[in-house]
Structure formats: C-alpha cells, structure tokens
C-alpha cells in the first residue's frame, strides 16, 4: 500500500492553446491511480474511473472545483507576468505524501517549458526561484489576494485531509488487484534468430516482474516496455532474442500482486497465434 500514500495534482497551462483546446488542465492522482480531471473549458473537477463510485461528502467535488479554479486563475495570470514573449507551457506538481509516521510531506514545484524553475517555500510562505521568470511570476502571485496563504492551506491542510479521506472512503479502489492476462509469442528476427515476446495485459497495481527461463534456468529479463491503459490498468511486455528452433526451450515467469504465486507462461503454438 506504500505507493498509494500520495495525492498529487499535475497542473498544466499553455499560453497559446489551439482553438477548441483548454488553456489549463489538471489530473489528480492517488498513488498510481488518476482520480480527478479538470480543464478550463468545462471548469468542473470530475472524478475518474472507479472514483466516480467513491462515497464522498456532498460538497467534495465543489471544493476541488473551487481550488482548481483559483489555480487556473493563477497559472493564466503567470503568462501576463511574462509579457508577450513565448509560447510558454507552465506546469505544476502540487500535493502531499503521507510518511510512515502518518505525517504529511508537501510537494510544490513548477516547470517552465519543461524545466523546473520555481518552488513554493513553506517556511517563508512564498514562491522561490532565481530565474527572472520565477521572480516575475512569484511577484505577480504574491499580489493576488491571499494567494500565498491559500497555497499554504492547500498544501498543509486540504491535501493531507483529502488524502486521508480517500484512504478511508476509497479503500476498495486503492486495494484493487487485477491479475494480468498473459501471452508468450515467437516471431522470426534476423536470419537464424527469433524474438520471444512475453506480454501482460490489463493488470493493476502497476508493479509487475517478467523474466525468462530456458529449460528451467534464468535466461534474463529481456528488453521491456510498460504503459498505462485508458481504464486505469497497465500493460507490459518483454522481448528476448533466441536462436531459431530453440524457442520451445523457453518460458516466461510473471510475478504480480494479483497472482497468488508466480505464473509460468508457455509459448503459444503457431496455430493459436494471430
């Protein structure tokens, strides 16, 4: 459950959005699960995936919406501080993590055009950074009504409170375990060689281990690929180059929290492969 003990908001604003696309959008994450989305076109914070069914207090999503509208205003205000130059992309990573002792550790950092350049300093209660752009934005934000106090409140109180609430009310979502469906296939490679690909589909949580055995002995982990699916689950694959004709000596072993024990995946017969 360690990987679930964080609540992070990924905020993005663009100074020159394409027609019909948002200038500001946010994804909210509980550990590896996206639970929230917001964009400036809709202007409403909305739950994602299974979090639609979380038994939250009636005003919860209104409060998320209010906070993110404030963030939207600040982020778009930042571009005014930077003047007419650009185009710019401003990103923020805001949130908190619960440590082993249940204390909250806040995170607040910002990137301009992909480079980290500014943070929010909790001790000093202000935004910091030494790029000229950081000074321009931080001074602009300081002038906004109670913006720094709101940021402090958000990081030190709202975030840990929400995280603890989700850990209580959404425990089922956080403890969700979906075992992978597996395939091991072979395809011809360079002359005299084949590529074995071990694929894992639709699993959760994302931690998963794939390795190959040859005649029961370790043959390595191969070259891997990993990514998210649109439904919140994940997929992964690993490929290993072997001598042609030797394929049937290999199998793939998968370990995952959704499996009671490691699963042995045998090579599919050519007829079954599509």
């Amino acid at each position: 459950a360690e990987s679930h003990l964080s609540l992070l908001y990924h905020l993005t604003a663009v100074s020159s959005p394409a027609p019909g696309t948002p200038a500001f959008w946010v994804s909210g994450w509980l550990g590896p699960q996206q639970y929230l989305s917001y964009n400036s076109l809709r202007g409403e914070a909305e739950p994602c995936g299974a979090w639609v069914w979380e038994n939250q207090v009636s005003w919860y999503w209104e409060k998320e919406t209010t906070d993110l509208r404030i963030k939207e205003k600040l982020f778009l205000e930042a571009f005014k501080a930077l003047g007419g130059k650009g185009p710019y992309t401003l990103q923020g990573l805001l949130g908190c993590e619960l440590g082993p002792d249940n204390t909250s550790v806040p995170t607040a950092k910002f990137a301009l055009n992909g480079e980290e350049f500014m943070n929010f300093d909790l001790k000093q209660g202000t935004w910091g950074g030494d790029w000229p752009e950081a000074l321009a934005i931080s001074q602009r934000w300081q002038q906004q009504d109670k913006a720094a106090n709101k940021e402090l409140t958000f990081l030190l109180f709202s975030c840990p409170h929400r995280l603890r609430e989700h850990l209580e009310r959404g425990r089922g979502n956080l403890e969700w375990k979906e075992p992978p469906s597996m395939r091991l296939k072979a395809r011809p490679s360079s002359p005299g060689f084949s590529v074995l690909t071990c694929s894992a589909f639709s699993f959760y949580p994302p931690e998963l281990q794939l390795r190959f055995l040859r005649n029961g002995l370790a043959a390595g982990t191969g070259q891997g690929d990993f990514g998210p699916n649109s439904d919140g689950s994940f997929h992964a694959s690993s490929s290993l180059t072997v001598k042609s004709g030797d394929e049937h000596h290999y199998c793939c072993i998968v370990q995952h929290a959704g499996l009671a024990q490691p699963l042995r995946v045998e090579l599919e017969s050519p007829a079954k492969s599509s």
Partner: antibody, heavy 119, light 106 residues
C-alpha cells in the same frame, strides 16, 4: 547601463560581524535575483545564496546558513549581506551578482568587497 | 553536493593555438555555465546553458557537453584570452563552481 556598486574594504576582529552592501542601478531591482559569491585567495568561487528583492525570498547554500543573512531594500535598490561570528576562514572577497541571464545565470557582477579578519 | 573538477588546473597556449579545457561533474547536470576572471577583476559570464556565448564574447569561444562531461574550447588562442575560467552548475542545490583552469599565454 547595469551596474552593481559594492561597499569598501572591511577589517574585522574574530567574533565580530560585518554588513556589506551592493547598490544596483540601470535595471528594475526587484525583477532579478541578487546572488552572492565568495572568493578566497588561491581558491575557487563558492555560492552563498540569493535573495529575490521583490518578495524577500532567500535561498542559502546550507554551508552559509548560519553565517550569512541576505536582505534587500527596494526603495534604495540595495542588497545587503551580513556575516556573523567572523573567523579567519571568512577572509575573502565577496561578490554580488545579478541573476539576470537565461535560467538565472549571473550576468552582471559587482567589483567585490574584501573582508579581512585578523586579531 | 555536486563536485565540479576542472582540468587542467593550469595550462599555457601559444597565440593561434587551439585550446580545450574540461569540467567533469560527479553527478549529471542539465547545463554548464562558464565564467572568465582576470586578476583584480570580477568574474564575467562567458558561456551560459552549455553552449551559448554571453554578450561580447568572441566567436572563437565555444562550449559543449552533456551529463557529467563539459568543455570550453578556444579555436585560436589570443593574448586577451589569458585568464582563469570557472565552470558552474545550477542543476542541483547548492549551486557549485569548479576550482578553475588558469590559462596563460606562451
């Protein structure tokens, strides 16, 4: 023309403190960070920290956290550095520099303030 | 702290000669900055963001590198280039400088 004018030579006894100044002109003082750098004879440069004059935000090299205090006065466009509990290790030339270049690079430097600590 | 090691510490070059000095970091940095300092003067920003020449820096200077290895090159040494050059990283706090390379003219 951007200029950073630093205060003159400081002679001090061990245990004493000094406060040096860096007066900025030729640009909007609060729009750029003021960095401070230490240079001891025969040694390299050491970054002490910076202040954002507009907000008062400071960021220190932990090594200098208990040694240096950075402040700024917007009305006079002047940055200050106070050094406390001086020892011979603090004998050096101290530079202020504007963080005005791309990604905050130090693009203009003061002429330096020489501090000598001796009993 | 990221330690920047400059080499050589001292070098001399004849007019017209190509000069290369290096700066090695014990941990990866995004960009390197170089400052030139002459005796009795303040440092001057010379190269920023690894390869960009500061205003007024002659085109015979260039900077390159990535990760943990960076260099400053002078295509053709001139007398006015004699100085100490410091590399500087701003990727990780505390910002640090190298010990400097002192370049002399033969």
């Amino acid at each position: 023309e951007v200029q950073l004018q630093q205060s003159g030579v400081e002679l001090a006894r061990p245990g004493a403190s000094v406060k040096m100044s860096c007066k900025a002109s030729g640009y909007t003082f609060s729009s750029y960070a003021m960095q401070w750098v230490k240079k001891r004879p025969g040694q390299g440069l050491e970054w002490i920290g910076y202040i954002n004059p507009g907000t008062g935000y400071t960021n220190y090299n932990q090594k200098f956290k208990d040694k240096a205090t950075l402040t700024a006065d917007k009305s006079s466009s002047t940055a200050y550095m106070h050094l406390s509990s001086l020892t011979s290790e603090d004998s050096a030339v101290y530079f202020c520099a504007r963080g005005g270049g791309l990604r905050g690079a130090m693009d203009y430097w003061g002429q330096g303030t020489s501090v000598t600590v001796s009993s | 702290d990221i330690v920047l090691t400059q080499s050589p510490a001292l070098m001399s070059a004849s007019p017209g000669e190509k000069v290369t000095m290096t700066c090695s970091a014990n941990s990866s940095v995004n960009y390197m900055y170089w400052y030139q300092q002459k005796p009795g003067s303040s440092p001057k920003l010379w190269i920023y963001s690894t390869s960009n020449l500061a205003s007024g820096v002659p085109a015979r200077f260039s900077g390159s590198g990535s990760g943990t290895s960076y260099s400053l090159t002078i295509s053709s040494m001139e007398a006015e280039d004699a100085a100490t050059y410091y590399c500087h990283q701003r990727s990780s706090y505390p910002w640090t400088f190298g010990g400097g390379t002192k370049l002399e003219i033969k």
